[in-house]
């Protein structure tokens, strides 16, 4: 029977800069029941605080609700593991909420095959930003990435869409059923999970175009950019 091993705070994430959660990995338990507590202070303070909510984020977590989340403040936190034989402390972790944002996936992904009479057919997709993110405040710039693949293919084809919430693709295999997903990330922060897959059947008479892909601006009727495969590769974010 031994004191507990050193825990490690391995991740902190915020969906929207208004709340955040941190998770830790326990060290060895020393063969005894072990209690964990997270304490923190803000940089510039010596007032020590305890985790306000050990429940919301699941096991080995601390959730900071709205009233505990301050923008422009760096949190200095550590986890204490205690059993009957003694205690051990994690290293201090410095957390600035601005840099730990991981949004929810984009919503309402719509995918359609467009076949205008006067132009080549294309795949058109549209989505909405996650509801927790308020883009109107100017706190956020969200960047989007799309991936798609034929249902039975192993490899995804990925396209960076910038800040647009609409996208066009010309190069597709006729007669194939495609899976399409979208994800987002703030300018400082982490990519969201991919949205649930949307399926689209490409008609057999869809005209193939391997040379170019077309990316539209916000308004499909507005200016459009023709982007080569080489340029597109330059925009990839993985």
């Amino acid at each position: 029977q031994l004191p507990p091993g050193k825990p490690e705070i391995f991740k902190c994430r915020s969906p929207n800069k208004e709340t955040f959660t941190c998770w830790w990995r326990p060290g060895t338990d020393g063969g005894l029941p072990t209690n964990y507590s997270l304490t923190y202070h803000r940089e510039g303070e010596t007032l020590m605080h305890e985790c306000p909510d050990y429940i919301t984020g699941g096991p080995n977590s601390c959730h900071f609700g709205k009233q505990y989340t301050s923008m422009w403040r760096t949190y200095v936190m550590m986890v204490n593991a205690t059993n009957q034989m003694g205690s051990s402390f994690s290293d201090e972790l410095y957390v600035d909420v601005t840099y730990i944002v991981q949004p929810d996936p984009p919503l309402e992904l719509t995918v359609e095959v467009k076949q205008p009479e006067d132009r080549k057919p294309y795949l058109w997709m549209k989505w909405s930003p996650p509801t927790l993110i308020d883009l109107k405040t100017g706190w956020f710039t969200l960047l989007y990435e799309i991936r798609l693949k034929p249902e039975k293919a192993a490899e995804w084809e990925t396209h960076f869409a910038g800040q647009q919430t609409e996208f066009k693709i010309l190069s597709l295999h006729p007669g194939q059923k495609y899976l399409v997903q979208v994800r987002c990330k703030p300018d400082h922060g982490y990519w969201s999970a991919w949205s649930p897959a949307t399926f689209i059947q490409i008609p057999s008479d869809f005209i193939m175009n391997d040379e170019q892909k077309l990316i539209s601006e916000e308004d499909l009727g507005g200016e459009q950019k023709l982007i080569s495969e080489e340029d597109l590769h330059h925009h990839h974010h993985h």
Partner: antibody, heavy 118, light 107 residues
Framework: EVQLVESGGGLVQPGGSLRLSCAAS????????MNWVRQAPGKGLEWISY????????YYADSIKGRFTIYRDNARNSLYLQMNSLRAEDTAIYYC???????????WGQGTMVTVSS | DIQMTQSPSSLSASVGDRVTITCRAS??????LAWYQQKPGKVPKLLIY???TLQSGVPSRFSGGGSGTDFTLTISSLQPEDVATYYC?????????FGGGTKVEIK
Amino acid sequence: EVQLVESGGGLVQPGGSLRLSCAASGFTFSSYEMNWVRQAPGKGLEWISYISSRGGTIYYADSIKGRFTIYRDNARNSLYLQMNSLRAEDTAIYYCARLSGVDIFDIWGQGTMVTVSS
Amino acid sequence: DIQMTQSPSSLSASVGDRVTITCRASQGISNYLAWYQQKPGKVPKLLIYFASTLQSGVPSRFSGGGSGTDFTLTISSLQPEDVATYYCQRYNSAPLTFGGGTKVEIK
């Protein structure tokens, strides 16, 4: 409605003891850090004690250290102040106050009067 | 311990006047400073925190400023309902010291 209600004040002789209680309602008491602040008649506010949400961190003002004990019972949504070795200068209204997430006193009780006199 | 000194200890001004109260910390406290208002016979009420952030529901005639050691609370146009004692308080470390208070009266 978010509310703090103090009780337990009264007249006590110097050297005596008293226990103040603060009953919380309308919010998740166990998530908040709590404090006692007092105000002597005609005087200013004096912070005297702090307790973290689970009771693991406690601070006292020098004026009460070793004589007063702060503790809490989250199951009962209650905060307490055990006051021993009371002195005349401890005469005051005692307020319990909730510490918000940004460390300011956002909710106050109505106060309970403690008079130490022979 | 860090001391908080308020000045003046009392003041009298006319309705509509601009009133400024000063609070000085004996050491730098960044902007970990709050202002409270206590009306006669009432419980203290939070006005401002982080030196300049107005608490929800507080009239916009109240404003706070300063950082480090010197802070101010300003009432841009004094109203009869502003008669009260105003306290500054630092909250970056224990003890969570209050200033001595400034009593504001109407002429």
